[in-house]
Each structure stands twice: as structure tokens, then as C-alpha cells.
């Protein structure tokens, strides 16, 4: 058993049929010694008396809010949550496996630049009685500070018969050094509590590996005289790190016909313009990627050829 | 060329070669697109590689003030990785196919380090830890980790030379 926060405790249980469970001793936070009784949740059934209560925690029926009273007055509470371990593996029932970029990916994180600011998100099908708390640091043995906000519900989607909820959190490294080569990864830890179930999820990454620039901005077409060619131009996204002579992007320009089956013409360039042939009913799209490190491409910015 | 006396490197040549190094480092070990056939193993094997850290003056302001600190750091790293790529870790079993990008990467690391420090000038170089794995499978794991680390190192070096070519070239 360990303390998650004041008056909230997590009991770690090996979860299998007829498991013996864990013996837990609760102590009433009071100077009083006599006349103390214990109850669980809203029940008025007295579970025991005295300053301590010894219980055998085997299942969710044994978890919950234990309260000690004296003469009708509440003295203190202890909330017991369960953390299940099945076949040596901690349960991951609360969050959905996003399976990208690999199986058992519960937390996904992205950064728009090298400033040390990043966003993480996760998915669940649970809609109520759910709380999250997020902590982060750079490195684990001698951790350096990363400040995370509160996790918030950022999107709801219908997937078949199920509703899926996306939660996200923003974090900022306290003393970021955008130009340095990271040697210690960022660690993100999410505590998830659903009713009386506790789970924890972690992710470890370098900012450079989660970079995904915003799409290029101000995408414009300029027809070239007496030609089917057009000059496409664009600018670096506002959110990208500066100066651009140091934090450079590379770009992919694509001409795509109306039909998805039509062959796509693609051009790669380090410049912020390119000359392409604009076909009728086609669209021109541009996306960006860090020029020197193969992290994610941005989403496409698009304009119609016409 | 960057020499201890403090003259400027051939920024544009360094920019071109460092950008080529980035491409080669990723073709020698791409991040995505195929099955990951390496075995899992202990993560502590490449902690001794040189990193370009916050105080090394490789940020735009530090380069403007005095690029020598940063260039010396980059040179140290290039020599370090060049030696690693020429070591038993990469030359031993399982042997890479003759035209593997690792060979070109090794040659380019040497080329850039010579651009930064011509013959006859000597900056201190970092001692290479003895990473001599006993098993061939350990070699494969080390190759993976060294190249992941090299990708990050050459990305910072390429940014330095791109910025230098754009703002510090005579």
C-alpha cells in the first residue's frame, strides 16, 4: 500500500481467482483513543472499533472510503483504491491502446517546435467517475523540472456503437534548451482513477522524436505566363522555432487529382516555393518536416488548382 | 577551416557535408517502415557518447559570440563516431552488405572532421569507451543505439553549419 495523495491510498493486488489479497491496517487521524468506530462508504454498518482497523483487501468490494467516527462526528477518511496486477502485468483497462506507432501505446505526445512545450493525449471509452493527474520530468535519476497543466477533455468521437473520449494535457520544460542535443528523455507519468480502480501509464521520449510542425502557412499559387505551370509559394508556420536559418524545414509539394487513384506528383524542396504543373480539378498540397531529423511530417496545407 | 587559432570554417562546404551526413544516418538506420528485428537489451550501452549540450555555444547566439567552442565540440563528436563506425562493432559479424550506407556514413564523418581540422592541428578528442561486445547479437544492438544517437548529433551539427553558412560566412 502506498499514498497517492493525502488520505488516498493505493493497494497493489495480484489479481487471480482465490488470491489471498493484502492485509491493510488503517489508522484514524485523531488524538482520540476510545469510542472510535469505522464504516465504509455510505453504509452505516460498523466494521470495527478502535483507533486502527485491520482489513483483508481482496476485491473492489473491499475498496472505497473508510471513515472513522466518534459520537456521530467524522474524525478522518482514508480512500482505498486498487491497482490490479494480472500475470505480473499491471492492468490497463482505463485507457485505450492507440496502437500507433506500436502496440501498447496509451499516451501519445507531440511538439510543434523545440521550445520544450509539448502536448500529450490519450483515449478512453469511460465517460464518468474518471480523474487524471499528470507529472513529467527530464530524466528519472536526477530529474529536471517539467510543468504540466490539468488534463482536460479535448474531444468526443463516436466509434461504431461506442463513444470515445480524448483527454489532453500541455507540458512545458522549465529550462528548455532548444539548440542542444537531448541526452536524457522526457518522462511523462499519468495517474488514472476510475471509480476505485487506479492505473498508471508512462511515456518516455526525446522532444526531437515527437516533433510535428504545423502545416506551412500562406500557401499561394502564381500562374506562369503561357504555361500550365504554376509557382507555389508558402511560409514557415508561426509556431516553428526561430531563427529559420538554424531550425530549418524541408517541404513536400504534391499535386493530387480529384480521384484518389490518380498518380500523385511529388516534389521535395528546402525552399519555400516550387514550380509544378497544375492539372484541371487537381489540388496542390504542401507539408513540412524538420530538415535534419526525420520526425513526423506536418499535416498538409492545400489549395485548389483552379 | 576551423583551426585552434580561430579562423572560420568553410561554412558552406560544412553545411553540404553535414546535410549529407543527416541523410546517410537515417538511411543507415531508418526509424520507420520496416519490422524491427533487433532484440531488446540494456539501455546503458551508449551513455558515454559526446552530446552537444546547452553550454557548448552551439545555439545561434553562442555561434555569433564565438563559434570555436561549438566547432570544437562538433569535431570531438565526429571523431568519436568515426572511430565507433570503424570499430569491430560495425566491422564484425554480422557483416553489413558491401554497399551499406554505414560505409558511406563512416567516410563522410571523416571528411567533415577533416574539413573542421586540417592535418597538423589538434584539438583534444574524447577517449572512446571500450564498447567491445562479446556476442554478435550485442553488436547489432549497439549499432542500433549508436546510429540513433548519431542521428541526433548530426542534426544539431547540420543546424549549426546551416546557420553559419547563412549568417557567419564572409
Amino acid at each position: 500500500i502506498w499514498e497517492l495523495k493525502k488520505d488516498v491510498y493505493v493497494v497493489e493486488l495480484d489479481w487471480y481467482p482465490d488470491a489471498p489479497g493484502e492485509m491493510v491496517v488503517l489508522t484514524c487521524d485523531t488524538p482520540e483513543e476510545d469510542g472510535i468506530t469505522w464504516t465504509l462508504d455510505q453504509s452505516s454498518e460498523v466494521l470495527g472499533s478502535g483507533k486502527t482497523l485491520t482489513i483483508q483487501v481482496k476485491e473492489f468490494g473491499d475498496a472505497g472510503q473508510y471513515t472513522c467516527h466518534k459520537g456521530g462526528e467524522v474524525l478522518s477518511h482514508s480512500l482505498l483504491l486498487l491497482h490490479k496486477k494480472e500475470d505480473g502485468i499491471w492492468s490497463t483497462d482505463i485507457l485505450k491502446d492507440q496502437k500507433e506507432p506500436k502496440n501498447k501505446t496509451f499516451l501519445r505526445c507531440e511538439a510543434k517546435n523545440y521550445s520544450g512545450r509539448f502536448t500529450c493525449w490519450w483515449l478512453t471509452t469511460i465517460s464518468t467517475d474518471l480523474t487524471f493527474s499528470v507529472k513529467s520530468s527530464r530524466g528519472s535519476s536526477d530529474p529536471q523540472g517539467v510543468t504540466c497543466g490539468a488534463a482536460t477533455l479535448s474531444a468526443e468521437r463516436v466509434r461504431g456503437d461506442n463513444k470515445e473520449y480524448e483527454y489532453s494535457v500541455e507540458c512545458q520544460e522549465d529550462s528548455a534548451c532548444p539548440a542542444a542535443e537531448e541526452s536524457l528523455p522526457i518522462e511523462v507519468m499519468v495517474d488514472a482513477v476510475h471509480k476505485l480502480k487506479y492505473e498508471n501509464y508512462t511515456s518516455s521520449f526525446f522532444i526531437r522524436d515527437i516533433i510535428k510542425p504545423d502545416p506551412p502557412k500562406n500557401l499561394q499559387l502564381k500562374p506562369l505566363k503561357n504555361s500550365r505551370q504554376v509557382e507555389v509559394s508558402w511560409e514557415y508556420p508561426d509556431t516553428w522555432s526561430t531563427p529559420h536559418s538554424y531550425f530549418s524545414l524541408t517541404f513536400c509539394v504534391q499535386v493530387q487529382g480529384k480521384s484518389k487513384r490518380e498518380k500523385k506528383d511529388r516534389v521535395f524542396t528546402d525552399k519555400t516555393s516550387a514550380t509544378v504543373i497544375c492539372r484541371k480539378n487537381a489540388s496542390i498540397s504542401v507539408r513540412a518536416q524538420d530538415r535534419y531529423y526525420s520526425s513526423s511530417w506536418s499535416e498538409w496545407a492545400s489549395v485548389p488548382c483552379s | 577551416r576551423a583551426v585552434p587559432g580561430g579562423s572560420s570554417p568553410a561554412w558552406t562546404q560544412c553545411q553540404q557535408l553535414s546535410q549529407k551526413l543527416c541523410t546517410l544516418a537515417w538511411s543507415a538506420h531508418p526509424l520507420v517502415g520496416h519490422m524491427d528485428l533487433r532484440e531488446e537489451g540494456d539501455e546503458e550501452t551508449t551513455n558515454d557518447v559526446p552530446h552537444i549540450q546547452c553550454g557548448d555555444g552551439c545555439d545561434p547566439q553562442g555561434l555569433r559570440d564565438n563559434s570555436q567552442f561549438c566547432l570544437q565540440r562538433i569535431h570531438q563528436g565526429l571523431i568519436f563516431y568515426e572511430k565507433l563506425l570503424g570499430s569491430d562493432i560495425f566491422t564484425g559479424e554480422p557483416s553489413l552488405l558491401p554497399d551499406s550506407p554505414v560505409g558511406q556514413l563512416h567516410a563522410s564523418l571523416l571528411g567533415l572532421s577533416q574539413l573542421l581540422q586540417p592535418e597538423g592541428h589538434h584539438w583534444e578528442t574524447q577517449q572512446i569507451p571500450s564498447l567491445s561486445p562479446s556476442q554478435p547479437w550485442q553488436r547489432l544492438l549497439l549499432r542500433f543505439k549508436i546510429l540513433r544517437s548519431l542521428q541526433a548529433f548530426v542534426a544539431v551539427a547540420a543546424r549549426v553549419f546551416a546557420h553559419g553558412a547563412a549568417t557567419l560566412s564572409p
Epitope: - | 538511411s27 543507415a28 538506420h29 531508418p30 517502415g33 520496416h34 519490422m35 524491427d36 528485428l37 533487433r38 532484440e39 531488446e40 559479424e93 554480422p94 557483416s95 553489413l96 552488405l97 554497399d99 551499406s100 550506407p101 554505414v102 556476442q135 554478435p136 547479437w137 553488436r139 547489432l140 549499432r143 542500433f144 546510429l147
Partner: antibody, heavy 122, light 107 residues
């Protein structure tokens, strides 16, 4: 020189099992990922499965997933393919092949065995 | 998965002629991950080219590979009698897939 010799093929009824072996010599077997590739009579090549050098990573073609198991015994320099729930469409010559490393994780198949014929027929 | 389509299905040429075999991918294949194999009747395939253009050990220099993205070519500059066989392209960058093969036969 590098040698790969397959064995264990034969005629088997649908739904039954068969185990193929590939004996390797002339190279450091435990350093290389190994593959099984098959070729139905008169048809092209189809990749079946791959196993990493130490044996902990295995990947399969969708057509055999859940039925075939690739394994290796590095102490015996031998690669195996356990084939269960065999179907008529599994009839083929089965080749084992060594993966030459182009980059540090993947590469083409630089050495092949001569193959062993598996016929699934009632 | 990446589908590789080879053309032509059969190519009839005479010894001494130049052979050009094509392999087209359904999506972009890094040139680093394309190989060509030769297979003669009753024999195992033999690696000819890897990395789109690098000749495997012991392969004569009349064999050459080129291409990038989705279009790759195997060229045999002067056909020898022993070159008549079936040729397969293969990508090994995203799982492993082979083309359906091109049969090179004597005219």
C-alpha cells in the same frame, strides 16, 4: 561457405501438421535474422515469416498468421517452421533464407536453401 | 502492404541483346530497400541487386539496377545464354513483398 539445407517436407492431409527444419553452416547463425519463403508450383515467391537473430521477434504473412510458428535453436544452428492446420493452398516449395543486413535492421535475402516440397492433399 | 507489379510478364530476346525489366510499387519504396533475384527452373532464387543499384557478391557487371520512388528497372546489358530465367523484384522496407516475376526467354 554459407549453406542452408531444408528438410521435413512431404505429403500431408489438410488440417494436419508438419515441421520443417533448416540446417545452417558456414556463418555465424546467431547473428542473422532468418526467413521462410514459399513458392507454389508454377507460381511466384511469397514471403512467409521472419525471426530475429536471438529469436524474440517474429513476424508472419497474414496468410499463415495463427497457423505457422517460426523458431530457431542457435545452439544447433537450426531454423524451424511449425505448420499447423495445413490447407491445400499451403502446397509449395519452402525455402529458408538468410537476411543480409543493408542497414542495421533489414536487408535482402542474400543466401537461400534449395527448398523442401510440402504437398497438402487428401 | 506494398504491391509490386513487374512488366512485361514475359520478355523474348536473343543472346547479345539488352534486356530491360520493370518493377512498379503501389507506394513509394526507399531505393535502399529494393532487390532483384534470378531464379532458374528447379533452383533457389539468387540475389542479384540490392539497394536498387548495388550488385551482390559475384554478380557480373552486365547486370545493373536503377530507379527510385515507385519505378525500378533491372537492365542486363548483353544477354548471355545463362541469363534466361525468371526475375523477381522485392521490397524489404515495409514487411517483405515480391513482384509476380518476369520470365526472360530465348527468342
Amino acid at each position: 561457405q554459407v549453406q542452408l539445407v531444408e528438410s521435413g517436407g512431404g505429403v500431408v492431409q489438410p488440417g494436419r501438421s508438419l515441421r520443417l527444419s533448416c540446417a545452417a553452416s558456414g556463418f555465424s547463425f546467431s547473428s542473422y535474422a532468418m526467413h521462410w519463403v514459399r513458392q507454389a508450383p508454377g507460381k511466384g515467391l511469397e514471403w512467409v515469416a521472419v525471426i530475429s537473430y536471438g529469436g524474440s521477434k517474429k513476424y508472419y504473412a497474414d496468410s499463415v498468421k495463427g497457423r505457422f510458428t517460426i523458431s530457431r535453436d542457435n545452439s544447433k544452428n537450426t531454423l524451424y517452421l511449425q505448420m499447423n492446420s495445413l490447407r491445400a493452398e499451403d502446397t509449395a516449395v519452402y525455402y529458408c533464407a538468410r537476411m543480409g543486413y543493408y542497414d542495421i535492421l533489414t536487408g535482402p535475402f542474400d543466401y537461400w536453401g534449395q527448398g523442401t516440397l510440402v504437398t497438402v492433399s487428401s | 502492404e506494398i504491391v509490386l507489379t513487374q512488366s512485361p510478364g514475359t520478355l523474348s530476346l536473343s543472346p547479345g541483346e539488352r534486356a530491360t525489366l520493370s518493377c512498379r510499387a503501389s507506394q513509394s519504396v526507399s531505393s535502399s530497400y529494393l532487390a532483384w533475384y534470378q531464379q532458374k527452373p528447379g533452383q533457389a532464387p539468387r540475389l542479384l541487386i540490392y539497394g536498387a543499384s548495388s550488385r551482390a557478391t559475384g554478380i557480373p557487371d552486365r547486370f545493373s539496377g536503377s530507379g527510385s520512388g515507385t519505378d525500378f528497372t533491372l537492365t542486363i546489358s548483353r544477354l548471355e545464354p545463362e541469363d534466361f530465367a525468371v526475375y523477381y523484384c522485392q521490397q524489404y522496407g515495409s514487411s517483405y513483398t515480391f513482384g509476380q516475376g518476369t520470365k526472360l526467354e530465348i527468342k
